[in-house]
Structures are given as C-alpha cells and as structure tokens.
C-alpha cells in the first residue's frame, strides 16, 4: 500500500473551492521531491493538472496552485471557480505520476441549489456590511415593507417599515424608505454572521399586487492566507479591515483546540505572555489598518490567527476578520544561536546578529523592546553611526564579523539594560530576531580606571587589567565614536601619536597618548577578542584639561582596580524618548524590524559560555 | 463542551454489516465546523483510525478512511440532528474492537489520522464480528 494518505472523496458544489491535503512520510528524498496532482484518464493515464515544479495545465490556469511544505510532510491542491466538469478520479502523489507514490482522490462537484428566477446573490465576508435592493411599484408605495429571510418551507419576518426587528439582528439592522419618486426600498444588515447565510424576500404590499424580489445572502468565512516562516524568524500580519471599525480596537488572536480565539495582543493593552519581548503591534493607518510584527519565531507559534476589530479587544460573532494559517520551517535558514545573553553590572556583552547574508550592504539596526501598550522599539544605534544620546560611550554595532553576522556590542552595563533588544536590518524583514540580556551577579574581568582627566601636551598612560583566561586572546584598547570604535594602532606598527604597550606578565594592556591633545578627549574601550569575534569590553572616559604642573601623567595600575567614578557617566538608563516606533523603517514590509531570534551571546571570547541558548557576557 | 455519545454497536457476523451513529450535543458553535471521525481499539492493542469526514463550508467536505477499510466504509453526517454515521460492510472478525467517536474544531490544518489532534472522545460502542 502507498504511504501518500489524503481525502478519499471530496465533494463541493459549482463556483466553490476545494484544498485538498496529502500527506507523506516526510523523508529527505520525499521532502524534495516532484509533487504532483492529475487525473485519472479512461485509458488508465494520469494527466498532470498542477505540479511542485511550477507546471499548471491550460484547464487549471488562474484557478488551481500546488504548495509543498516539507517539514511537514504535506503538500496542498488548491483548486477555486469548481464546475460540474471537476468532477472525476484524480491522484496525488510523489514522483513520477505512472510509478510514483499516489493516493486515489475521488471529486464530486455538484449543481449548487436551484434559486428562484430572479434572484440577486449578495456576496459578503463575516463582520462586512451588505445592503440588499428590494425594488416596489407605485401602489405600493404607501403600503408595508418587510424583509423576510426563508428558512425550508416557512419565511420569518428579519424587518419591517412597521418597526419591527427580529432579535437575531437586533442594533445591526435598519430599513430605509426613499424620498417620493424612488421606487426601491433598501435593507442594510451591519456585522454579518455566518448564521445570516440564506435565501431572502423581500416584500412591499400585500395580497396579489404585492412585489417580491429574492435575494441569496452568501456570509463567507475569510479563507486562511497560508504563511509559511522560518523557525527564529519574523512574521508580519497585516490586517486592513476596513473604514467603518477603524476607530474601533484591534486585536491579534490565535485560534485554539476549542475553537475559541485566545488574544496574543490588542490595542487595549493585554499581550499573551508567551509573545513578551517578540511582539509589536504598530500604530493604526487613517484607515484603520495595522500590522502585528513576532520575532524570534517557535514550532509551537504555528496555528491559524485571526485579527479582527470589536470594543472588548477580542473576537465576536459578527466583526470583521482576517485570516492567517502560519507554518513554521523547521529547516531554518536562520541560524541558531543564544536567545538570551547574560552579564554583570559593570561589565559589557556583546551579541551577535543574523541577517540575511545576501544583503551586506543593508542598513543594520539595534533597538530595545518596550512592552508598554502595543508595543514600541525605539532605535538605539544604527550602522550609520547614529546612537542614542543615553548610550554614549558604551553602545557601538560593528559589521564583523559579516558574511550574515553583525555585532552590537553594549557596556558599563546595569540593571536597567536588562531586557529585550531586536536586531534589525532594512532588507529582508523575516530575519528579524530578538535577544535577551539578563544582569546577572558577578564582577567585570577587565578593570580600568573609572575617571581620567589628562593634561594637554603630556603622556597619558591608561592601564587595563585582564584576568588570565584572556592571555590567549587578542587585546585592544579602541576610541569610540558615533560611528564605532577606531581600533587604535598598537607599538610594532612604529610611533604615533597613539599606541598600545601590552606587558602580558603583568596582564596588563595600556593605552599610550602621546602628546595628549584636546582631540583626545572621549570615550576609549578596552576590549578582548578572537579574530573578528569580539569578548568583553570595559570604557573610560578621558577629559582633557590645560596644563598645571609639569611631568607626565601616568594613572597607576592601583588606581585601574578601583570601580568606575559613578560622576563620569549617569549609569541610569533614562526612558529613550525616541520616534523609532513611528518610523516607517520599523514596519514597511521592505525596510525595518528583525527578530534577533536565538541571539549570539555576550562574551564570545569569553571561555565559560553558558550553553547554546544562553551566553554569558562576563564570566565571574 | 461537546459531549459524544456513540450507538449502533454489537454482534455480527463476518460478512455482515453496522452501522453506528455518534451524536454531538453541548456546542455553542455550528456542528459542521467540527471534523467528526471515527477510530477503533482491538484488545492489546493500540486505537487507530478509521475514518473522518470534514465541512470547509456547507457544501464542501472531505471523507478519510484508513487503507486496511477502505471500500468497506461510508462516512456521513446529518447537521440537522448534530450527528455522524458509520457503514461498515463485508465485516470481517479482525473488525472486532471498540469503535470511538471523535471531534475537533481544528478545521483543515492536521492529518486526521492523528489521534492527538481530537479533542473530544466518546465513551465507545462495542462491535464483535464473529466467524
């Protein structure tokens, strides 16, 4: 027997459409092989209809698409506009359509019920608005309208022109009769429910004279848009569900088990738990349509999504919606890496990005995930060099090591800087990921002075201790500035203003200016890394003042040990009041907002790495 | 909460036929928008499936059967009377099991043979083929 399994019998009616699922034991060979859908002619032939390859026959052009999902060990056959001509045996299968693995699909499309002569098809989504036309002569002008909707034999009254509503469409109903001279009456039903599908009349006058036009009021739940994301990566949804609720809340909501719809965000506040960190919901357009951006995405995100607009924030019968089944790869082209990364207060981490390799050249991106109301991520540094006043001196992205990876690197760390970050890029919006940075205890492993002021025209000697672990490691001491940190040139690349004296014997690695200039003034790290991974950082700002007693200056390597002067940098991070969320870039599809999905953790040189999921950025 | 409650159940012998009903009751939602199915557990061993029939809308549905069954079954349902039927024809003794009734509101997004995946179960119904 054929492994493939898949509907036995389907069966729809004319104009309708069907999805048919096959499934298949999701080997690799399986995985990437031709999928196929055909029919089964007299002559025991089967007759490719639509293929994984991209073939659709002339018969099926416009209205059939075959989709693989490998991971899953499905593919889908959807075919739309069905007609009686459907009807028939058909195969899908694996390989090749004569000797492949196959399943027998039987389909049977049949006439849709007969409507009355005359009839109007009124077409509309669930939570839509429909207004249905109901023509009278004169001399019934005067006389009674009504609406009646046609349940088997009987008709029971929905609305008339005598005030009357009927419960089921109670505060969502309204009759309307023109002025003198128009002969058309019109009937408006607001918030459509799937229960509102049928046959209609409706009625003006009574006995022989009385007018009669029938309409068939079709509700159509919305068909799932198939979504298929990487695992670590970003989704967006877009959801634009029309004027009349865009001063109404929105909501995201996923479908569960039950067939209720649990909230995963709404305008109003609430924000399921397990999206904390991973989860925006931008500003509304004029028009009333918004996005949900998940990053960082999970096997377990998978699941169809509605979003839709109701005053509770949360989905009801009758509001309009918009459908999403999402599908989560497995077989990520993002790479794994930590999605947490520790340090300690004082210290620094460094975390490493993904982005899309075949987009080097993109804009790169770091902003900090705020969870108050919908959600916000304001930008603290961008690869053009732009950091947010607050981060001075201790924030830099750097593009190594490239090929896929950037790195941002944040230190003088304190327990505000615990939180959620985004890495961003302005090209492929899907490798948005978010990282984690927990405060752990502990203390820096590189030490340095915490306040130096040198003096114009002199030496400056700034001193920065490593612990041991490091002596293996590549040590720098770097200036930064807006745009990164500008290694400075170390001894053997001969005399310069600026050099680095390393004594490794005294773990020591120094900073020499020499004549100290005003130019000098800033912020310098010192840093260890391995080739273009970087480890932990320490910073120091140095201010520089007019000469007042002769001889050189020399901060002592006692002095290093002391903690930084809490006067040279205001530690706290203050709230970033930043416009980054309204910026275009952080929700146009084509630009802004990655997911920093499983994150490269703080110390990479660091030797006590925690685990593949979490990274230590200083080790105690 | 649906409740399922199978019948339909009991002796026959090889050759012969049942057919068993499960009627749902205590949904808030629309009976078509549940896959309704149909699996069975021999003694000693494990419940496997025989059959489901899933509604996209009202007029379009989906019939699984399993292989070791198939063109002996026919799956239906009446919406009206919130209830599922199950034909079995030419029965053989290795059909001898307890047949369960099962429902889901998971729509079109699983395979239907896993049984993980149905949320509601009824208590069963015995059916005994004998030779």
């Known amino acids: 027997k054929s492994p493939v399994f898949g509907p036995q019998e389907v069966s729809s009616v004319e104009g309708n459409s069907v999805s048919i699922k096959c499934y298949y034991p999701p080997t690799s060979v399986n995985r990437h092989t031709r999928k196929y859908w055909c029919r089964k002619g007299a002559s025991g032939r089967c007759i490719t209809l639509v293929s994984s390859e991209g073939y659709v026959s002339s018969n099926y052009a416009g209205r059939a698409n075959l989709t693989n999902f490998p991971e899953n060990g499905t593919f889908v056959v959807n075919i739309a506009q069905l007609s009686r001509d459907d009807s028939g045996h058909y195969k899908c299968g694996l390989g090749i359509n004569s000797r492949g693995l196959s399943f027998d699909v039987s389909l049977e499309v049949s006439q849709g019920p007969e409507l009355p002569n005359g009839t109007e098809v009124y077409t509309v989504d669930v939570g839509r608005t429909v207004t249905i036309k109901c023509p009278f002569k004169t001399e019934n002008a005067p006389k009674t309208k009504a609406l009646y909707k046609k349940i088997g034999q009987t008709s029971v009254l929905v609305i008339d022109s005598r005030n009357y509503v009927n419960p089921n469409y109670k505060d969502r109903i309204r009759l309307r009769i023109p002025g003198t001279g128009q002969l058309i009456f019109t009937v408006v039903i607001d918030r459509l429910r799937l229960s509102d599908h049928g046959l209609y009349l409706c009625q003006a006058g009574d006995g022989s004279n009385r007018d009669e036009k029938n309409a068939d009021l079709q509700v159509l739940e919305p068909e799932p848009e198939l979504v298929y994301e990487d695992l670590r990566g970003s989704v967006t949804f877009h959801c634009a569900l029309g004027l009349e609720v865009a001063n109404v809340a929105k909501f995201l909501c996923r479908v569960n088990s039950r067939e209720t719809c649990d909230v995963v965000i709404n305008t109003l506040g609430k924000r399921d738990s397990a999206f904390e960190g991973r989860i925006l919901l931008n500003p509304q357009d004029k028009d009333g349509s918004f996005s949900v951006v998940i990053t960082g995405l999970r096997k377990e995100d998978e699941g169809r999504y509605l979003c839709g607009a109701h005053s509770d924030g949360q989905l009801q019968e009758g509001w309009p919606i918009q459908a999403w089944q999402l599908f989560v790869n497995e077989e990520s082209t993002i790479p794994r890496s930590p999605t947490v990364v520790k340090g300690v207060a004082g210290g620094s981490v460094a975390v490493l990005c993904p982005y899309n390799p075949k987009e080097s050249q993109s804009l790169k991106y770091w902003c900090l995930w705020e969870g108050a109301q919908n959600g916000r991520c304001p930008l603290l540094v961008e690869s053009q060099g732009l950091v947010q006043e607050q981060y001075e001196g201790r924030l830099s992205l750097l593009q190594e090591p490239g090929n896929g990876t950037f790195t941002v690197i944040l230190n003088q760390l304190t327990t505000q800087d615990a939180g959620f970050y985004w890495c961003l890029t302005n090209g492929d919006t899907r490798w948005r990921t978010t990282v984690e940075i927990k405060i752990i205890e502990g203390e820096p492993n590189l030490k340095v002075p915490g306040n130096v002021t040198a003096v114009l025209g002199e030496t400056l000697n700034i001193p920065c201790h490593f612990p041991c672990k490091f002596s293996s490691y590549e040590k720098y001491w770097c200036k930064w500035s807006n745009t990164g940190c500008q290694t400075l040139p170390s001894q053997d690349e001969g005399p310069s203003e600026a050099f680095v004296n390393c004594d490794e014997n005294s773990r020591l690695v120094s900073l020499t200016l020499n004549p100290v200039t005003r130019a000098d003034e800033g912020w310098y790290w010192c840093g260890v890394k391995q080739g273009h991974f970087y480890g932990e950082t320490a910073a120091v700002y140095v201010a520089v003042e007019e000469k007042k007693v002769a001889g050189s200056r020399y901060v002592s390597p006692a002095k290093a040990d002391a903690a930084p002067d809490e006067k040279v940098l205001d530690s706290g991070v203050r709230e970033i009041e930043n416009k980054a969320i309204q910026d275009p870039r952080l929700f146009a599809e084509e630009k802004v907002v990655a997911d920093t999905g499983d994150q490269a953790g703080g110390s990479r040189a660091s030797v006590d790495s925690s685990s593949s999921e979490e990274q230590g950025g200083s080790s105690k | 909460e649906v409740q399922l409650v199978e019948s339909g159940g009991g002796l026959v012998q090889a050759g012969g036929s049942l057919r068993l009903s499960c009627a749902a009751s205590?949904?808030?939602?629309?009976?078509?928008?549940?896959?309704m199915g149909w699996f069975r557990q021999a003694p000693g061993k494990e419940r496997e499936f025989v059959s489901a029939l899933t509604w996209a809308d009202d007029s379009t549905y989906y019939k699984y059967y399993a292989d070791s069954m198939k063109g002996r079954l026919t799956i239906s349902r009446d919406n009206a009377k919130n209830t599922v039927y199950l034909q079995m024809n030419s029965l053989k003794p290795e059909d001898t099991a307890v047949y369960y009734c099962v429902a889901t509101g998971r729509g079109l997004t699983y395979d239907p043979r896993d049984r993980r995946k149905y949320d509601y179960w009824g208590q069963g119904t015995q059916v005994t083929v004998s030779s």
């Open positions: 205590g949904s808030g939602r629309t009976f078509t928008s549940y896959t």
